[in-house]
């Protein structure tokens, strides 16, 4: 028996359902009574779901997993993982035993899009050219950790005097705060881009300083 899984990681958004694909080629005359199937976490070998003795033994993992019972006899041993969490990320092994045995591992990559950045200035009034100003770009509830880029109005990257911090909340999602310290010119636009490296999703925020008033 040969077990096949997708070589590319499965990308799943937080709180959505994901399918970890696994298949095998049943011999002629195969019946589910002959099948033993185990899904487990590859690293810890923690049991996730099993099928044996002709029966679905159910989820051993947060009661959020399910097989596709009608498709098993065709060799579809895929696992459905419901309401995906950040902690579900990792490698899962599909182990199939009939008169022979084989296994293969599939990776689950969890992702969550970042919110549109909010921009704040400090100080935020009585600004004049030559003043040192702190611009903070904040984006929330994303996963995995973001990449943050700053640019000026001409699209020139601003790399000096940037401090970025990322803090995970209780669900494992990250809040990003990136601080740019610049000396103001006569007027200018400062934009921040928060990129989710897995989703290739970019969230933009900008602030334009034109003497008075400020535009966000």
């Amino acid at each position: 028996v040969e077990v096949q899984v997708s070589e590319d990681p499965v990308v799943a958004l937080v709180d959505t359902d994901a399918t970890l694909r696994c298949s095998f080629s049943p011999e002629p005359g195969f019946s589910l009574a002959q099948l033993n199937l185990i899904w487990q976490l590859t690293d810890t070998k923690q049991l996730v779901h099993s099928f044996t003795e002709g029966r679905d033994q159910g989820s051993a993992y947060s009661n959020r997993t399910a097989l596709f019972p009608d498709l098993l006899v065709q060799g579809n041993a895929s696992l459905r993982l419901q309401r995906v969490r950040v902690t579900d990320e990792g490698s899962y092994t599909c182990f199939v035993s009939i008169q022979d045995f084989d296994s293969a591992a599939v990776s689950l990559q969890v992702a969550a899009p970042y919110s549109k950045p909010s921009m704040t200035l400090e100080p935020n009034k009585d600004l004049r050219p030559g003043n040192m100003v702190t611009i903070t770009c904040s984006s929330y509830q994303g996963y995995p950790e973001a990449e943050v880029f700053w640019k000026d109005g001409q699209g020139v990257p601003l790399t000096g005097n940037v401090t970025t911090s990322q803090m995970a909340n209780e669900r494992g999602l990250f809040d990003v705060h990136s601080v740019l310290r610049v000396v103001l010119g006569a007027n200018g636009t400062y934009s921040c881009l928060v990129r989710n490296p897995v989703l290739q999703q970019d969230a933009h925020g900008s602030v334009t300083i034109t003497g008075q008033p400020l535009t966000f």
């Epitope: 028996v1 044996t52 008169q99 296994s103």
Partner: antibody, heavy 118, light 110 residues
């Protein structure tokens, strides 16, 4: 008739090497997983290693990992166990077994005796 | 020390029914199944039951296996003198990725 016939056992000193063979007949050898199981004198059964039909998936007991190598030659209908760095505690009768549904072993050879002693 | 736990010995008189237990865990018997082997003195083991309760052809129906949760048992009814042997339970352990045997139970027919 389905048969498994082990050979290659013997007496050797600690640190020595030995290769066991298991000749299979009476069934489609290349379609089945195979195991080695051992039994020390007066003791119970201990699973040693398993290999799937095409040799792509192999498992070992912790007690032999890194020292023993299971392999197969489907063209010769033969299963092998290469045993290196042998220890006194490897002394046992070694059985070759055919894999069956539900993790079972439905056919066993008569066993070959390996004695490791100085 | 075996992953599956069996009593070291059991006994019964001819005609009696005896039961041998095998205790495992969520990752072996609980997740998969259990198989039983009989080893008569001086011979190789023989598969007695598989998938917890099925018998290979040639095994008398006096032998019956069952499983409940993480435990299993082998019942032998109408005990006969030729049933005197060592009995082993076995399973696949998903947390170890190994096949595992119980320590064996020596059955004596009195």
């Amino acid at each position: 008739e389905v048969q498994l016939l082990e050979s290659g056992g013997g007496l050797l000193q600690p640190g020595g090497s030995l290769r066991l063979s298991c000749a299979a007949s009476g069934f489609s050898f290349s379609s089945y997983g195979m195991h080695w199981v051992r039994q020390a004198p007066g003791k119970g059964l201990e699973w040693v290693a398993a290999i799937n039909s095409d040799g792509s998936r192999i498992y070992y007991a912790d007690s032999v990992k890194g020292r023993f190598t299971i392999s197969r030659d489907n063209s010769k209908n033969t299963l092998y166990l290469q045993m290196n760095s042998l220890r006194a505690e490897d002394t046992a009768v070694y059985y070759c077994t055919k894999y069956y549904y539900h993790y079972a072993m439905d056919v066993w050879g008569q066993g070959t005796t390996v004695t490791v002693s100085s | 020390q075996s992953v599956l736990t069996q009593p070291p010995s059991a006994s019964g008189t001819p005609g009696q029914r005896v039961t041998i237990s095998c205790s495992g865990s969520r990752s072996d018997i609980g997740a998969t199944t259990v198989n039983w082997y009989q080893q008569l003195p001086g011979t190789a083991p023989k598969l007695l039951t598989y998938q917890s309760h099925l018998r290979p052809s040639g095994v008398p129906d006096r032998f019956s296996g069952s499983k409940s949760g993480t435990s299993a048992s082998l019942a032998i009814s109408g005990l006969q003198s030729e049933d005197e042997a060592d009995y082993y339970c076995a399973s696949w352990d998903a947390s170890l990725n190994t096949w595992v045997f119980g320590g064996g139970t020596k059955l004596t027919v009195l």
